[in-house]
């Protein structure tokens, strides 16, 4: 689609005569008829296939024709066409005499023709005017012409439609050849595809407008390059959405079970060595001089009563020192200079001579011990408390302080792991020596029967366009992870593409 423009510039008819030579009366009141048609080697009569246009009376006899385009006037003359410009044409320009104001052919004199010119040739689409002048015996016409494309048409023959737009169907302006030039931030054949935020992940992110980065289900972060782990994942990470890959030292479906209590909590004090011994379970190996479950108690070297025969113990920086009673000597007062004659046995102990009276031994009554029966029996010396329990003397009896997870007089019993009802969905709990086991009802599985196996939301392949399906364990629903170019809960919609185009 385009316009053939004809700019009449000057018409000379000095004698004021018609083509026949007859003078115009009172003068040649001149108007023009223009016929544009297909190329003919010899321009012949017939339909004006490309269009026709007439002017009003522009002047009398000889006159210049002013450019009236700026005021919306008729010069240049416009001959619009609604087809591909063929590059060739034939043009007939007739000058007519109209004695009155009625320019209809039947209202003109029988001999009203002042002049007619016919030209033909090639004409390319362009902004430049071609100037021409046609002279006959009595008249001269100077004019110029050109072909330009209509609004929104481009190319060598005005056949390429391009209408700039900035809406859902495209964001572009038109180049001189009719090709689209995308507005900043848009790309694609019709400039419908927004250019997402720089760095936005190609597969996991998308955008509906430029410089945006919207994440597909299962992804997060400014550039949608961080996966979203399973809902409730505590100490775990993911490489694909809805995973929960446990950090070192953590276990369980949600990585909330502490398998490395030692590292995470450092329970052992005073430089003790910590050993993991199960979920939330540990053992502290104390350095010399410390005791307690967590080696939190400072141990005096004298607490073990190393001095015998009634010797008194004195703590020192580098150990201890025994002050022996009369008749004894040695590091622990273990050597005696006494005999039974000296009544060395205390607390009702019986003395027995040894080595021909050079030595003796005391036989102690119950609750007393020591070489001279000088010590009350310490019921904790035999380490009666099992599973790392701490033994405490309580007068004539003793008591075990048990570590978490154990009970009983001697801490010999595991606290029942089943007491907390850890098995979900009606699972049956069984205590084991080193933990527990759940027997799950039909339709459930997992260490705690927390996984619903009877409903696989992805089994029906609900995701389109080769999307990846994930089952959300907490809601028994599915989540589709769309490939690049698709969106929607089932990845059923191509990104940005409307169902049809208006052109």
């Amino acid at each position: 689609s385009g316009v053939f423009q004809l700019q009449l510039q000057e018409f000379i008819n000095e004698r004021g005569v018609l083509a026949s030579g007859r003078p115009c009366e009172p003068g040649c009141r001149t108007f023009f008829r223009v016929c544009l048609k297909h190329f003919q080697a010899v321009v012949s009569p017939g339909p004006c296939t490309f269009g026709t246009v007439s002017t009003p009376v522009l002047g009398t006899n000889s006159f210049a024709v002013r450019d009236d385009s700026s005021g919306g006037g008729r010069n240049p003359l416009q001959l619009p066409f609604n087809f591909t410009w063929p590059g060739t044409f034939s043009l007939i320009i007739e000058a007519w005499h109209a004695p009155g104001d009625d320019l209809r052919p039947e209202a003109l004199p029988p001999d009203a023709l002042i002049s007619k010119i016919a030209i033909q040739g090639s004409l390319a689409v362009g902004q430049n005017w071609l100037l021409d002048e046609q002279t006959s015996t009595l008249t001269r016409l100077r004019y110029s012409y050109r072909v330009i494309c209509s609004d929104n048409y481009y190319g060598d023959n005005c056949s390429r439609l391009c209408k700039k737009r900035n809406d859902h169907f495209g964001h572009y302006v038109c180049q001189p050849d009719g090709n689209l030039s995308c507005l900043p931030g848009w790309t694609g054949e019709y400039c419908q595809q927004p250019i997402c935020l720089s760095g936005c992940h190609e597969q996991n992110g998308y955008c509906s407008k430029p410089a945006e980065c919207l994440c597909r289900p299962g992804w997060q972060g400014r550039l949608c390059n961080e996966c979203i782990p399973h809902n409730g994942c505590r100490h775990g990470t993911c490489s694909t959405p809805w995973q929960c890959t446990c950090d070192e030292g953590w276990g369980g479906l949600f990585c909330d079970q502490d398998l490395n209590y030692c590292t995470h909590h450092s329970p052992c004090k005073n430089g003790a060595t910590c050993s993991n011994s199960g979920q939330r379970s540990y053992t502290c190996t104390c350095r010399p001089g410390y005791t307690g479950v967590d080696c939190e108690l400072e141990l005096s070297e004298c607490d073990s009563n190393p001095c015998r025969n009634g010797g008194s113990c004195k703590d020192q920086e580098d150990g201890y020192h025994c002050l022996c009673p009369p008749g004894y000597y040695g590091l622990h007062c273990e050597h005696s200079t006494l005999s039974c004659a000296d009544s060395p046995c205390f607390n009702g102990g019986s003395c027995r001579e040894r080595n021909q009276g050079a030595n003796y031994a005391c036989e102690c009554p119950p609750n007393f011990t020591g070489s001279n029966c000088e010590k009350k029996v310490d019921r904790c010396t035999s380490n009666p408390c099992a599973n790392g329990g701490q033994c405490l003397n309580r007068g004539p009896s003793r008591m075990c302080r048990c570590r978490p997870g154990f009970t009983g007089t001697y801490c010999e019993l595991h606290v029942s792991d089943c007491a907390r009802n850890p098995c979900a969905h009606g699972g049956t709990c069984h205590d084991l020596e080193n933990g527990l086991m759940c027997t799950c009802p039909a339709g459930f599985s997992g260490r705690r029967c927390e996984v619903r196996t009877s409903i696989d939301a992805c089994a029906s392949s609900p995701c389109f366009n080769r999307a990846t399906c994930y089952t959300d364990l907490s809601t028994d629903t599915f989540v589709c992870n769309c490939p690049y170019g698709f969106v929607g809960s089932r990845c059923e919609f191509p990104v940005g593409l409307p169902p049809s185009f208006p052109w």
């Epitope: 083509a19 026949s20 007859r22 029988p110």
Partner: antibody, heavy 119, light 106 residues
Framework: EVQLVESGGGVVQPGRSLRLSCAAS????????MSWVRQAPGKGLEWVAD????????YYADSVKGRFTISRDNSKNTLYLQMNSLRAEDTAVYYC????????????WGQGTMVTVSS | SYELTQPPSVSVSPGQTASITCSAD??????VSWYQQKPGQSPVLVIY???NRPSGIPERFSGSNSGNTATLTISGTQAMDEADYYC?????????FGGGTKLTVL
């Protein structure tokens, strides 16, 4: 139906006068130029005269100039040709014709009326 | 005065193309009309403004005008086309007719 009907022809002596009439019907007479064209026996067509819509412009062939007068009565839709000083060479069939505007030519013709100038 | 020259006669076989010429100086700058006249009848306009056909005129009639010559062409000539043909234009005094051409369909 568009129609032109001539009348007034006949035999006349040289030097005498004759008035031809042409009755128009079927079109708007006052909107058209009208003409007279004659054809001598066995010869070609010859334009005689024409007249503008309101009668303000009249043109004549050199051969009849000063002797013939073209006129019209738009109220009667009638065209006239007053022929004076007739000559033998004026003998012909005289046609009334509508002269279409804009160099179309004569698009409607009457059946013609014969004028014979003879002594 | 301005003279339009036509050949006195042209013959053509039925179904063939007949061409009748009309010559004058710089005739191509003017418009030419053509008339058909059969014996005992009034003339009929068959071509105006060089090559336009009035309504009712068969398509086999066409015309052209270039340079010094105008041409009436009858393609597929029929017996009913046998007649006298006149070209017509205008000069400073008024309408001018050619001498006429008798078309004979053999």
């Amino acid at each position: 139906e568009v129609q032109l009907v001539e009348s007034g022809g006949g035999v006349v002596q040289p030097g005498r006068s004759l008035r031809l009439s042409c009755a128009a019907s079927g079109f708007t007479f006052r909107s058209h130029w009208m003409s007279w064209v004659r054809q001598a026996p066995g010869k070609g067509l010859e334009w005689v005269a024409d007249i503008s819509q309101d009668g303000s412009y009249k043109y004549y062939a050199d051969s009849v100039k000063g002797r013939f007068t073209i006129s019209r009565d738009n109220s009667k839709n009638t065209l006239y040709l007053q022929m004076n000083s007739l000559r033998a060479e004026d003998t012909a069939v005289y046609y009334c014709a509508r002269a279409a505007g804009g160099n179309v030519g004569f698009d409607i013709w009457g059946q013609g009326t014969m004028v014979t100038v003879s002594s | 005065s301005y003279e339009l020259t036509q050949p006195p006669s042209v013959s053509v076989s039925p179904g063939q193309t007949a061409s009748i010429t009309c010559s004058a100086d710089k005739l191509g700058t003017k418009y030419v009309s053509w008339y058909q006249q059969k014996p005992g009848q009034s003339p009929v306009l068959v071509i105006y403004q060089d090559g336009n056909r009035p309504s009712g005129i068969p398509e086999r009639f066409s015309g052209s005008n270039s340079g010094n010559t105008a041409t009436l062409t009858i393609s597929g000539t029929q017996a009913m086309d046998e007649a006298d043909y006149y070209c017509q234009s205008w000069d400073q005094s008024g309408a001018v007719f050619g001498g006429g051409t008798k078309l004979t369909v053999l």
